[in-house]
């Protein structure tokens, strides 16, 4: 089982939307896949996928989950608020037929205030 997560860094304006993608690949077929998104180490949601469907469509405040076969799990935050800023990690585990787990690398989300004057110093702190 392997998990690739992206992007590494995401900077968005407050009130817009942010999309985090997790690609989950497994050499053999799986019957049930447990997935988990965390923010700063705290669990946002922990649904499972079976028969091609997610057991849960929401993930944390203003978060929506989707599964696109064969391998893409997407977390969409809309609208984004300042407290969405943080470090997000996607984790996956094949529960059936046999346990195997993996996690992605961190996606760092920075949310800029809607008022650009509040943001002048922060942009200088996070170039690019």
């Amino acid at each position: 089982l392997s998990v690739q997560q992206g992007p590494n860094l995401l900077q968005v304006r407050q009130g817009s939307q942010a999309t985090l993608v997790c690609q989950v690949d497994q050499a053999t077929a799986w019957e049930r896949l447990r997935v988990k998104w965390t923010k700063d180490g705290a669990i946002l949601c922990q649904p499972y996928i079976t028969n091609g469907s997610l057991s849960l469509g929401v993930c944390g405040p203003q978060g929506r989950l989707s599964w696109q076969a064969p391998s893409h799990l997407t977390l969409q935050l809309d609208p984004v608020s300042l407290n969405h800023s943080g470090a997000y990690v996607c984790w996956a585990a094949v529960e059936i037929p046999e346990l195997e787990e993996a996690e992605g690398n961190i996606t760092r989300l920075f949310v800029d205030p809607d008022d650009p004057t509040q943001n002048r110093n922060r942009i200088a702190s996070f170039p690019g």
């Epitope: 392997s2 690949d25 497994q26 050499a27 053999t28 077929a29 091609g52 076969a69 391998s71």
Partner: antibody, heavy 120, light 113 residues
Framework: QVQLQESGPGLVKPAQTLSLTCTVS??????????WSWIRQFPGKRLEWMGY???????SYNPSLKSRVTISRDTSKNQFSLKLTSVTAADTATYCC????????????WGQGTMVTVSS | DIVMTQSPDSLAVSLGERATINCLSS????????????LNWYLQKPGQSPKLLIY???TRLSGVPDRFIGSGSGTDFTLTISSLQAEDVGDYYC?????????FGDGTKLEIK
């Protein structure tokens, strides 16, 4: 690019242990998402997957070989190895190492194979 | 274990003609979770290791000529060579990776008529 090379004795006596090593070049066997397999081809051309060791050191074996087979690795040498105990003439075959990935689950790179004969 | 049954055992086809090889699995190789069929096709030429032609039942590996066509779903799969070339002779194998143990078909020997 990745290359695999099998090595080991070409003749093994019945009831002894067959030991082969696959040396991987151009790619680390610890790379996440990759599996390192042993496959054998019998004289009649039939192919049999024997088992794999994955990037984390986890293994999976063909139940048809019962508890006779062990696959291990040496990451410092970028090698993985096969041990098959209690061999008989029925284990005479060409033994190949091969790799596949989670993302593209097919055997995309194979060694050229080494012929092993079990005979006294 | 999933049993892979190939037919025919051998096949002789004239150059430029169509060759068809079948593979039947003892259980479905389709997953609704991934919308994939876990089936591969290989060609083994004399003195060489098998080389992948088709994966996920119908996806040609980059560099494989488009005369090689994989089709089918579930338990019934077909490899078609639309116009046989001299370099296509060899042994063809189907292989599943739905679960472990991974298993291969017994092969189909393709020759020029």
């Amino acid at each position: 690019q990745v290359q695999l090379q099998e090595s080991g004795p070409g003749l093994v006596k019945p009831a002894q242990t067959l030991s082969l090593t696959c040396t991987v070049s151009g790619f680390s066997i610890s790379t996440s998402g990759y599996y390192w397999s042993w496959i054998r081809q019998f004289p009649g051309k039939r192919l049999e997957w024997m088992g794999y060791i994955n990037y984390g050191g986890g293994t999976s074996y063909n139940p048809s070989l019962k508890s006779r087979v062990t696959i291990s690795r040496d990451t410092s040498k970028n090698q993985f190895s096969l041990k098959l105990t209690s061999v008989t003439a029925a284990d005479t075959a060409t033994y190949c190492c091969a790799t596949m990935a989670d993302r593209f689950a097919f055997f995309d790179v194979w060694g050229q194979g080494t012929m092993v004969t079990v005979s006294s | 274990d999933i049993v892979m049954t190939q037919s025919p055992d051998s096949l002789a086809v004239s150059l430029g003609e169509r060759a068809t090889i079948n593979c039947l699995s003892s259980q479905s190789l389709f997953s609704s979770n991934t919308n994939r069929n876990y089936l591969n096709w290989y060609l083994q030429k004399p003195g060489q290791s098998p080389k992948l032609l088709i994966y996920h039942a119908s996806t040609r590996l980059s560099g494989v000529p488009d005369r090689f066509i994989g089709s089918g779903s579930g338990t019934d799969f077909t490899l078609t060579i639309s116009s046989l070339q001299a370099e296509d002779v060899g042994d063809y194998y189907c292989q599943h990776h739905y679960e472990t143990p991974l298993t291969f078909g017994d092969g189909t020997k393709l020759e020029i008529k």
